[in-house]
C-alpha cells in the first residue's frame, strides 16, 4: 500500500512523508518562520524604534540576518541537487513499480515542493529587503556616529587645551599662594611677637593704672583739702586787706570765722569752691562720724551726693540689713551710701532725689522727686517721695505711699512672699512694687524676661534689667 502524510515534528518543523511499499521518503522543510516572536529585541516585521539602537546591537542583528540568508541559500541548492539526483532514480522506479495513480501523488508532491520553494523565495526576498533597509539605517547611524565622534574628538581636543591652560594658571597661582603663605607665616610670627610684647606692656600698665588709681583717690582728697585751704587763705587775705584799708582799723576787731573742715553733703563742698567730681569725706549731722561719698559736681549744676550707683555688676547687692544701714561697695564704682546716713541727712533739711537710668540700647532717662526723705530705722527706713518729673515714666516706679525697706534678712514688704529674697537686693518693696535698682545685675542679651533684675517698671517694664543707675540727692534750696 502507499499513502501521503503531512505532519509537524517535535521541534515544530513541517515534514512531508511518502510511504511506498517498503520504502518511506521523508522531506524535512526548512523553518520559514525563522524570525523570532515580537517579544524579542530583534523583531522582523515590527515597526522600527525611534531611538537608534546601539552600534553593537545593529551589527549583531545584521550578522543574524546574513546567517539566515546564507543558510536558506545553501539549503535551496542542496534541495535542488537532491531533487535532480534522487528524483530521476525514483521516477524510473515508480514508473516501473507503481500503477498510474502513484504518478498523481508524485505530481502533488512536486507541486507542493514548488509552492514551498516559491514561498521560501518570497520570504527570502522579504528578508533581503529588510536586510537592505536595516543596512541603510545602520549606514546612516554609522555616519551619524562618525560625525558625533568627530565632534567629540574636537571637543576633547579643545578641552584638553583648556585643561593645559588651567594647569598652567593653577601652577602659577599655587606658586603665588606658597609665596603668600610664606609672607603670612612671617607676618603671623611678627604679630605673635608683638602680641606677647603688648601683653607684657598691658600687664605692666594694669599695675601702673592700679597704682595711679590709688594715687588719684589720695590726690582727690588732698586736692579737696588744698582747694579748701586756698579758699580759706584767700578769705583771710581779703579780710586782712579790708582791715588794713579801713580808717577805723585800729578800733576794728579781727574776728576770723572758724574754718569749716567738715561737710554734711556734696552741696556744701561745691559751695565751698570744690567743684571737681570725686570722692569726698562727709560727716554725719550732729556727729563726728565720717563717711566717704562720691560727689557729682557736673550734672545739673553739681552738688549731688550719690547714694547709689550700679554700672557693671562688680558688687553684690544681696546684702544684710546691717550692710544696707551702714553702706557697702566703692564710691569710685558700684556702692550703697548707707540708709542711716541718708535718713539723718534728709531728716534735717528738704532734699530732692534724682535717679538716672541707662538701658542696653544706649538710651538714658531720669526721674526727679522734689521732696525725698527716709524715716529712721525704727520705721524701717520708709521712703517718702513727692513731686515726680522726668523722662523715666509719668508714674512713680517707687510705690506711693512709701514702703518700708526690706533686705534678705529683714522682710518688711506687703507681700505674702519675701520680695528681697525673691527679687534680690534691699529695696523699698511693696508687693513687690514697680522698681528695684538693687536687683541682680544681668549683662546685655541676658537682661530681658528677668523679674529679679534692675527694674524701673514705668520706663522699661517688668522684665527688663537696666545697664546703669545712679541715685543722687541735693538740698532743695541749692
Amino acid at each position: 500500500y502507499s499513502n501521503f502524510r503531512k505532519s509537524v515534528d517535535s521541534t515544530g518543523r513541517r515534514q512531508y512523508q511518502v510511504q511506498n511499499g517498503p520504502c518511506s521518503y521523508t522531506f524535512l522543510l526548512p523553518e520559514t518562520d525563522s524570525c523570532r516572536s515580537s517579544s524579542s529585541p530583534y523583531m522582523s516585521n515590527a515597526v522600527q524604534r525611534d531611538a537608534p539602537l546601539d552600534y553593537d546591537d545593529s551589527v549583531q542583528r545584521l550578522q543574524v540576518l546574513e546567517n539566515i540568508l546564507e543558510n536558506n541559500t545553501q539549503w535551496l541548492m542542496k534541495l535542488e541537487n537532491y531533487i535532480q539526483d534522487n528524483m530521476k532514480k525514483e521516477m524510473v522506479e515508480i514508473q516501473q513499480n507503481v500503477v498510474q495513480n502513484q504518478t498523481a501523488v508524485m505530481i502533488e508532491i512536486g507541486t507542493s515542493l514548488l509552492n514551498q520553494t516559491a514561498a521560501q523565495t518570497r520570504k527570502l526576498t522579504d528578508v533581503e529587503a529588510q536586510v537592505l533597509n536595516q543596512t541603510t539605517r545602520l549606514e546612516l547611524q554609522l555616519l551619524q556616529h562618525s560625525i558625533s565622534t568627530n565632534k567629540l574628538e574636537k571637543q576633547i581636543l579643545d578641552q584638553t587645551s583648556e585643561i593645559n591652560k588651567l594647569q598652567n594658571k593653577n601652577s602659577f597661582l599655587e606658586q603665588k599662594v606658597l609665596d603668600m603663605e610664606g609672607k603670612h607665616s612671617e607676618q603671623l610670627q611678627s604679630m605673635k611677637e608683638q602680641k606677647d610684647e603688648l601683653q607684657v606692656l598691658v600687664s605692666k600698665q594694669s599695675s601702673v593704672i592700679d597704682e595711679l588709681e590709688k594715687k588719684l583717690v589720695t590726690a582727690t582728697v588732698n586736692n579737696s583739702l588744698l582747694q579748701k585751704q586756698q579758699h580759706d587763705l584767700m578769705e583771710t587775705v581779703n579780710s586782712l586787706l579790708t582791715m588794713m584799708s579801713s580808717p577805723n582799723s585800729k578800733s576794728s576787731v579781727a574776728i576770723r570765722k572758724e574754718e569749716q573742715t567738715t561737710f554734711r553733703d556734696c552741696a556744701e563742698i561745691f559751695k565751698s569752691g570744690l567743684t571737681t567730681s570725686g570722692i569726698y569725706t562727709l560727716t554725719f549731722p550732729n556727729s563726728t562720724e565720717e563717711i566717704k561719698a562720691y560727689c557729682d559736681m557736673d550734672v545739673g549744676g553739681g552738688g549731688w551726693t550719690v547714694i547709689q550707683h550700679r554700672e557693671d555688676g562688680s558688687v553684690d547687692f544681696q546684702r544684710t540689713w546691717k550692710e544696707y544701714k551702714e553702706g557697702f561697695g566703692s564710691p569710685l564704682g558700684e556702692y550703697w551710701l548707707g540708709n542711716e546716713f541718708v535718713s539723718q541727712l534728709t531728716g534735717q533739711h528738704r532734699y530732692v532725689l534724682k535717679i538716672q537710668l541707662k538701658d542696653w540700647e544706649g538710651n538714658e532717662a531720669h526721674s526727679l522727686y522734689d521732696h525725698f526723705y527716709l524715716a529712721g530705722e525704727e520705721s524701717n527706713y520708709r521712703i517718702h517721695l513727692t513731686g515726680l518729673t522726668g523722662t523715666a515714666g509719668k508714674i512713680s516706679s517707687i510705690s506711693q505711699p512709701g514702703s518700708d525697706f526690706s533686705t534678705k534678712d529683714s522682710d518688711n514688704d506687703k507681700c505674702i512672699c519675701k520680695c528681697s529674697q525673691m527679687l534680690s537686693g534691699g529695696w523699698w518693696f511693696d508687693a513687690c512694687g514697680p522698681s528695684n535698682l538693687n536687683g541682680q545685675y544681668y549683662p546685655q542679651k541676658q537682661n530681658t524676661n528677668k523679674f529679679n533684675g534692675i527694674k524701673w517698671y514705668y520706663w522699661k517694664g517688668s522684665g527688663y534689667s537696666l545697664k546703669a543707675t545712679t541715685m543722687m540727692i541735693r538740698p532743695a534750696d541749692f
Epitope: C419, M422, Q440, N449, F451, G453, S462
Partner: antibody
C-alpha cells in the same frame, strides 16, 4: 486685708450666656494681673484665663477660646468673665485669683476668691 | 502644654508622721533667672485653694514651717515634716513657666 468677692454664678441652658464678677479690695487692684481658674465637680483645677494689670495682655485656655471674654475695670476694682455659648462641660466652680506679685510678674496665685458655681444644663 | 504628674493620688497619713508628695513636669521649669516656676497649693475641704510654696521652694507667709518644697528642673517634692489634722485636703502642684499654666491631678491627704 486682701479680699476677692465673686458673684454671677447660676444655672444656665447650653448655648446661653453668663457673666461672672470679682470685686477686689485691700490692695492696689490696678497693679496686679488677675486670673480665672475653674474646678469641675469632683475634679482638679483648670486655668481658664489671664488679664494683665493694665488689661493690655490677655490669655485664654484653648477650651474656652472664642467663647469666653475676660475684662477688668480698674476704676471699679473689678474683674469680669463673660461666658457665651456655654456647654455642659463648662459646669464648674469658677475662682478669680490674684497674681502673687504685682506688675505682671507671673509667679503663682497669692489670693483666691470664694468661688461661684456655674451649672450648664438643659 | 506642659503636663504635670503627681504621685501618689491618695496619701493616708498618721498624725505626727511625715508625708511626701511628688510632682513631675513634662519639661524643665527652671527659668534663666535661676528660679523654678513651680507652686504648691492646698485646697481644704469646702474651701478655695491657698498658696503654700512659690517658685519651687519659697514658703508663703503664714504657712507653717513644717511645709517645705524642693527640687529643680522636672522633679519636685512637697514635704510635711509632721502631719497635723488641719493639713487634710487636696494638694496641687502648678507650673507657671508657660501659658497655659497647668496643674497636677491633685493628691488627697487624709488622716489614718
Amino acid at each position: 486685708e486682701v479680699q476677692l468677692v465673686q458673684s454671677g454664678g447660676g444655672v444656665v441652658q447650653p448655648g446661653r450666656s453668663l457673666r461672672l464678677s470679682c470685686a477686689a479690695s485691700g490692695f492696689t487692684f490696678s497693679s496686679y494681673g488677675m486670673h480665672w481658674v475653674r474646678q469641675a465637680p469632683g475634679k482638679g483645677l483648670e486655668w481658664v484665663s489671664y488679664i494683665s494689670s493694665s488689661g493690655s495682655t490677655i490669655y485664654y485656655a484653648d477650651s474656652v477660646k472664642g467663647r469666653f471674654t475676660i475684662s477688668r475695670d480698674n476704676a471699679k476694682n473689678s474683674l469680669y468673665l463673660q461666658m457665651n455659648s456655654l456647654r455642659a462641660e463648662d459646669t464648674a466652680v469658677y475662682y478669680c485669683a490674684r497674681d502673687l506679685l504685682d506688675y505682671d510678674i507671673l509667679t503663682g496665685y497669692g489670693y483666691w476668691g470664694q468661688g461661684t458655681l456655674v451649672t450648664v444644663s438643659s | 502644654d506642659i503636663v504635670m504628674t503627681q504621685s501618689p493620688l491618695s496619701l493616708p497619713v498618721t498624725p505626727g508622721e511625715p508625708a511626701s508628695i511628688s510632682c513631675r513636669s513634662s519639661q524643665s521649669l527652671l527659668h534663666s533667672n535661676g528660679y523654678n516656676y513651680l507652686d504648691w497649693y492646698l485646697q481644704k475641704p469646702g474651701q478655695s485653694p491657698q498658696l503654700l510654696i512659690y517658685l519651687g521652694s519659697n514658703r508663703a507667709s503664714g504657712v507653717p514651717d513644717r511645709f517645705s518644697g524642693s527640687g529643680s528642673g522636672t522633679d519636685f517634692t512637697l514635704k510635711i515634716s509632721r502631719v497635723e489634722a488641719e493639713d487634710v485636703g487636696v494638694y496641687y502642684c502648678m507650673q507657671g513657666l508657660q501659658t497655659p499654666p497647668t496643674f497636677g491631678q491633685g493628691t488627697k491627704l487624709e488622716i489614718k
